[in-house]
């Protein structure tokens, strides 16, 4: 807290300019008018103030706007944004995508800070949904953003926004998140032809049900092993050997290297060894010939 002292004669700031870096903290407090600061915030970022000095300027803005800063000030905070606490940011009402971009730029190229997380939360809540332009912006700055949302939050993503999603944006998504995103992607890409559709939907397939995987197996898609390994185990288990062979195409040979890992391991345990042998890959662990297969899950459902 800076002591209230009178501004020395001739030092009253008439504009926010570089001469202010030569002001001591108490001079900034005494000689810079908060309203002037608010109208000329865009200049502050171009002046190499110390954060100690910026603290004084922040204090002046806090006094002027105790209920939270107006967007005209927020948009021009620049490096002063890095002095804001999440509590400060929760008071803001940020509606302009330009404001969001300006503040994300300050944090660019680095992990999401608590301030940025709060800012994004305020912005998205204010908009009511995660529209395409917002998603475009957020994933450009933070590729992992989508996967940081809960399934409930993801449910507000309209299918049209899915076009903004790049494969790397989904790298850290878990199955619960993909369960929500996959139906939206399916809807978004439904009018595309076979090969184009597969290219777009591929990253979302970790949320695909069995019937969709069966349908894909009829389309010569040649799914790579990395994608196959990310499929839901419960969606893979009902697939036949023939369906998996068609789904993977030339990549089917990769099953051997993955036979100890899910979902391949669990799928092998559900197939007849005879059928597995037709692949010629030496996959072991299938059901021996002559054994009866009981679907216990079906039996439990009936009892």
């Amino acid at each position: 807290e800076v002591e209230k002292t009178a501004c020395p004669s001739g030092k009253k700031a008439r504009e926010i300019d570089e001469s202010l870096i030569f002001y001591k903290k108490w001079e900034l407090e005494a000689c810079v008018d908060a309203a002037l600061l608010a109208t000329q915030m865009d200049r502050v970022n171009a002046i190499p103030f110390t954060y100690e000095q910026l603290d004084v300027l922040k204090h002046k803005l806090d006094e002027l706007y105790p209920q939270g800063y107006p967007e005209s000030v927020i948009q021009h905070l620049g490096y002063l944004f890095l002095k804001m606490s999440p509590e400060d940011i929760r008071k803001w009402n940020v509606t302009s995508l330009e404001t969001l971009k300006a503040l994300l730029e300050v944090n660019k190229g680095h992990e999401m800070s608590p301030q940025v997380a709060t800012l994004i939360d305020r912005f998205v809540k204010g908009r009511g949904q995660l529209d395409k332009d917002t998603l475009d912006t957020l994933t450009a700055f933070y590729p992992g953003y989508l996967c940081s949302l809960s399934p409930e939050e993801l449910s507000s993503v309209p299918p049209s926004s899915i076009w903004a999603v790049r494969p790397q944006d989904l790298d850290t998504c878990d199955p619960r998140q993909l369960d929500v995103l996959y139906p939206k992607a399916r809807l978004a890409f439904q009018n595309m032809n076979g090969s184009e559709y597969f290219v777009k939907i591929q990253s979302f397939l970790g949320g695909a049900p069995t019937e969709d995987l069966k349908a894909l197996s009829q389309q010569n898609v040649s799914m790579d092993l990395a994608t196959f390994m990310k499929l839901r185990t419960d969606a893979v288990l009902p697939l036949t050997v023939a369906e998996v062979q068609k789904l993977l195409g030339p990549h089917v040979e990769g099953l051997k290297a993955e036979e100890r890992h899910r979902p391949v391991r669990d799928w092998i345990l559900r197939q007849r060894q005879d059928d597995l042998d037709t692949l010629g890959l030496g996959l072991q662990g299938g059901i021996p010939n002559g054994y009866l297969v009981l679907d216990l899950s079906m039996q439990e459902a009936l009892s």
Epitope: P48, T50, L82
Partner: nanobody, 119 residues
């Protein structure tokens, strides 16, 4: 984060010195950089500063004689001081306006200072 100054020493009036400040450690980012000085019994005051965009600002008393520069590849800031005067005897401090990700806030970083004596 550490800022380490070097290049200080004893110089005759009218002489020149070049101060260097090397930044090391993991810093989130550096925005502005500056040189400050503190004469015996005085408060620390800015001498020269540079914004992230490369604009430079000088105290009136050093304009035309001092030059601040920055080599981003070497993480180093320089202060070229020419036509030095006895009253410029002081400890010169390097300053960086940065961001500490661990703290989650913008931070002021200061070097330990390098002594310049003009006599």
């Amino acid at each position: 984060v550490q800022l380490v100054e070097s290049g200080g020493g004893l110089v005759q009036p009218g002489g020149s010195l070049r101060l260097s400040c090397a930044a090391s450690g993991s810093m989130f980012s550096i925005n502005a950089v500056a040189w400050y000085r503190q004469a015996p019994g005085e408060q620390r005051e800015p001498v020269a500063a540079m914004t992230s965009g490369g604009s430079t600002i000088y105290a009136d008393s050093v304009k035309g004689r001092f030059t601040i520069s920055r080599d981003n590849a070497k993480n180093t800031v320089y202060l070229q001081m020419n036509s030095l005067k006895p009253e410029e005897t002081a400890v010169y401090y390097c300053y960086a306006q940065g961001y500490d990700y661990d703290e989650g806030y913008g931070m002021d970083y200061w070097g330990q200072g390098t002594s310049v004596t003009v006599s």
